[in-house]
């Protein structure tokens, strides 16, 4: 059965050019943490396995950086990186853990950080 | 972009033969890399896979005379004490290991062991 | 130690036909394959990934399905360029094993 639940940044905005902090944290399980993927819809970001480190993919190389920990950072953001984030936490043994996060980027300084909230 | 530098060739079984593999364009800091190899004629035969962190698997066969190391551009697949068997196409790709696949793979070299 | 069985070995097909490739692992492997075309003198190109999500650029007349441990890669509409030969590999697990790959699937078209 899985008990766990991932918090996740939420609902967030950040200014065109600037930089956002993608962050999920997996809670109430004991299941060993096997790998996180960072996808965007459907494309894969990132990835970070327990045993071999952190895997950035090659189209993203150049805007996307490893943590802090789990997370994962998005620079020289750009309009088109609007949309949903999902983190991916595969786990030993419960399975297979989701987190959505919706990036606005705003052409204005107008960029406020949305709530945080749970999904199960 | 994925290339192997190292030409193949010619080795004796007394070599200690090494191969690298250069990654243009970008760091290997955040990217895993495999190596493969394929005998003339035969299928494919994973080696090993070095992480960003620079952990290493290997397979079965490989462990203790097949090394993988790594530099911020370069991979590199040291073979001690070749044999005759290990006659093979070497290939390195980017991921393997749960990156959803491996890609994209440099063109491949061809290592000969004859004594 | 996961083995990857690969059937068959070699398949002919007429071109426009459907050609489907089996791939059985010895333990559940969680949708962790990937499958590649290789054509002679070349490196094997990534075609499909987590079992059945197409990679860039491949076109829509290769698809893969599968769970646990039974897999399937199928071409249909077969032409001409998908002479190659096939390869499963598994992404599960690293540990003990002998080889992440199928020992390959050769399609002729006639």
């Known amino acids: 059965m899985m008990t766990g639940t991932i918090e996740t940044t939420g609902n967030i905005s950040a200014e065109k050019g600037g930089s956002i902090i993608l962050q999920c944290h997996l809670s109430s399980t004991t299941a060993q943490v096997t790998q996180v993927n960072w996808e965007q819809q459907d494309q894969l970001l990132a990835i970070c396995n327990a045993d071999l480190g952190w895997h950035i993919y090659p189209a993203f190389k150049d805007r996307v950086a490893p943590g802090p920990g789990l997370g994962l950072t998005l620079q020289s953001l750009t309009v088109n990186d609007t949309g949903e984030y999902f983190c991916i936490y595969h786990t030993y043994p419960d399975g297979t853990y989701t987190g959505r996060i919706f990036l606005e980027v705003l052409e204005s300084s107008v960029a406020e950080h949305g709530a945080r909230f749970q999904i199960p | 972009q994925v290339q192997l530098e190292s030409e193949g060739g010619l080795f004796k079984p007394t070599d200690t033969l090494t191969l690298t593999c250069t990654v243009s364009g970008s760091s290997l800091s955040s990217s895993y890399m495999s190596w493969v190899r394929q005998a003339p004629g035969k299928g494919l035969e994973w080696i090993g896979i070095?992480?960003?962190?620079?952990n290493t698997y290997y397979a079965n066969w490989a462990k203790g005379r097949f090394t993988i190391s790594k530099t911020s551009t370069t991979v590199e697949l040291k073979i001690t004490s070749p044999t005759t068997e290990d006659t093979a196409t070497y290939f390195c790709?980017?991921?393997?290991?749960?990156?959803?696949?491996?890609?994209?793979w440099g063109p491949g070299t061809l290592v000969t062991v004859s004594s | 130690d996961i083995v990857m069985t690969q059937t068959p070995a070699s398949v002919e097909v007429a071109v426009g036909g459907t050609v489907t490739i089996k791939c059985q692992a010895s333990?559940?492997?969680?949708?962790?394959l990937n499958w590649y075309q290789q054509k002679p003198g070349q490196p094997p190109k990534l075609l499909i990934y987590?079992?059945?999500k197409l990679a860039s650029g491949v076109p829509s007349r290769f698809s893969g399905s599968g769970s646990g441990t039974e897999y399937t890669l199928t071409i249909s509409g077969v032409e001409s360029a998908d002479a190659a030969t096939y390869y499963c590999?598994?992404?599960?697990?690293?540990?003990?094993?002998?080889?992440?790959f199928g020992g390959g699937t050769e399609v002729v078209v006639k």
């Open positions: 070095i992480g960003s962190n620079g």
């Open positions: 987590d079992a059945l």
């Open positions: 333990q559940s492997i969680s949708s962790y």
């Open positions: 790709a980017r991921g393997g290991y749960r990156t959803s696949g491996m890609d994209p």
């Open positions: 590999q598994q992404e599960h697990s690293v540990g003990n094993v002998d080889n992440v």
